[in-house]
């Protein structure tokens, strides 16, 4: 069976939107009005992995782009990157480990934990216009909570 996917946008708990910053990076900033069209639309795919009521394994691709968020070690540090893939082969039910995030729902907010690096989360900075990154702390300065907005395909 083909992998199930939905289109969505994400905003952090400070209502910052995610936009492209160069070809392989996302940044978070406040957008209003027509600028909202700049925000990236994700194709969220529901993939194979350990699942529970509040934890669902997903892959986050950029809609109509052959790019996926992935988590790898760079200089011995877990790092978030946008990775290009062959569109003929993706998305797929069995994604490589680096592409998988545990989508965790807590109090109507979403966290995205790296399946490859437990307790590391997709994060944004308090500051405006800063890169989206993989952070190893929750509840500190950096933001790990998001809301999801469905986008019709």
């Amino acid at each position: 069976a083909p992998v199930r996917s939905l289109n969505c946008t994400l905003r952090d708990s400070q209502q910052k939107s995610l936009v492209m910053s160069g070809p392989y990076e996302l940044k978070a900033l406040h957008l209003q009005g027509q600028d909202m069209e700049q925000q990236v639309v994700f194709s969220m795919s529901f993939v194979q992995g350990e699942e529970s009521n509040d934890k669902i394994p997903v892959a986050l691709g950029l809609k109509e782009k052959n790019l996926y968020l992935s988590c790898v070690l760079k200089d011995d540090k877990p790092t978030l990157q946008l990775e290009s893939v062959d569109p003929k082969n993706y998305p797929k039910k069995k994604m490589e480990k680096r592409f998988v995030f545990n989508k965790i729902e807590i109090n109507n907010k979403l966290e995205f934990e790296s399946a490859q690096f437990p307790n590391w989360y997709i994060s944004t900075s308090q500051a405006e216009n800063m890169p989206v990154f993989l952070g190893g702390t929750k509840g500190g300065q950096d933001i790990t909570d998001f809301t999801m907005q469905f986008v019709s395909s």
Epitope: Q48, G49, E50, V72, L73, E83, S84, V85, D86, N89, K94, E96, K97, R98, A115, Q116, F117, P118
Partner: antibody, heavy 120, light 107 residues
Framework: EVQLVESGGGLVQPGGSLRLSCAAS??????????VGWVRQAPGKGLEWVSH???????SYNPSLKSRFTISRDNSKNTLYLQMNSLRAEDTAVYYC????????????WGQGTLVTVSS | EIVMTQSPSTLSASVGDRVIITCRAS??????LSWYQQKPGKAPKLLIY???KLHSGVPSRFSGSGSGAEFTLTISSLQPDDFATYYC?????????FGQGTKLTVL
């Protein structure tokens, strides 16, 4: 010191089954980020990746073998297994156990290998 | 699956020679490539990972380069201990696949 010691190889008839073991020491199979798997090498041929399991139980298989081979592990024994069913002559190979950390993979530590011969 | 093609399949060289082995992928594999050395009757040994990072304990005469779909393993000055078979492995996409190997023999 990391050690991987395979066992369970031997002569088996076509259609038969075999379970390989890989006893790991010097590290824990359940350590976050840890991966272990099987790579085989037919006599005089190159290396072929067979199967892999991550610390959290996430399994991957070479699609050409998935229906017949099953990877598993016992964390209490720190041991990896490969259950091989419906064996064919072309499964004759040395089977190596190999360890990696994280994806993308590179195999840092290898066992000495165990020979599986499928013949009547 | 991604097909990895090594060239040459066999290579004869002398001690002190500079040797280059090439590995081509059937599609872009980023820098997710590792190299292994294997001697007869022995398990493979990791030489290089992430295309160009030298594994600990591996002599500096070994180096790796490339990106995308074409990669090279270079031995700057061949030593007697280097005569072996070399394999590349791609980790970009499951199933992980090896090159067919390059056998390095004494000229």
């Amino acid at each position: 010191e990391v050690q991987l010691v395979e066992s369970g190889g031997g002569l088996v008839q076509p259609g038969g089954s075999l379970r390989l073991s890989c006893a790991a020491s010097g590290f824990s199979l359940s350590t976050s980020g840890m991966g272990v798997g099987w790579v085989r090498q037919a006599p005089g041929k190159g290396l072929e990746w067979v199967s892999h399991i991550w610390w959290d139980g996430d399994e991957s298989y070479n699609p050409s073998l998935k229906s017949r081979f099953t990877i598993s592990r016992d964390n209490s024994k720190n041991t990896l297994y490969l259950q091989m069913n419906s064996l064919r002559a072309e499964d004759t190979a040395v089977y190596y156990c190999a360890k990696n950390r994280y994806d993308p993979p590179w195999f840092v530590d290898w066992g000495q290998g165990t020979l599986v011969t499928v013949s009547s | 699956e991604i097909v990895m093609t090594q060239s040459p399949s066999t290579l004869s060289a002398s001690v002190g020679d500079r040797v280059i082995i090439t590995c081509r992928a059937s599609q872009d594999i980023s820098n997710y490539l590792s190299w292994y050395q294997q001697k007869p009757g022995k398990a493979p040994k990791l030489l290089i990972y992430y295309t160009s990072k030298l594994h600990s304990g591996v002599p500096s005469r070994f180096s790796g380069s490339g990106s995308g779909a074409e990669f090279t393993l270079t031995i700057s000055s061949l030593q007697p201990d280097d005569f072996a078979t070399y394999y590349c492995l791609q980790g970009k996409m499951l199933p992980w696949t090896f090159g067919q190997g390059t056998k390095l023999t004494v000229l």
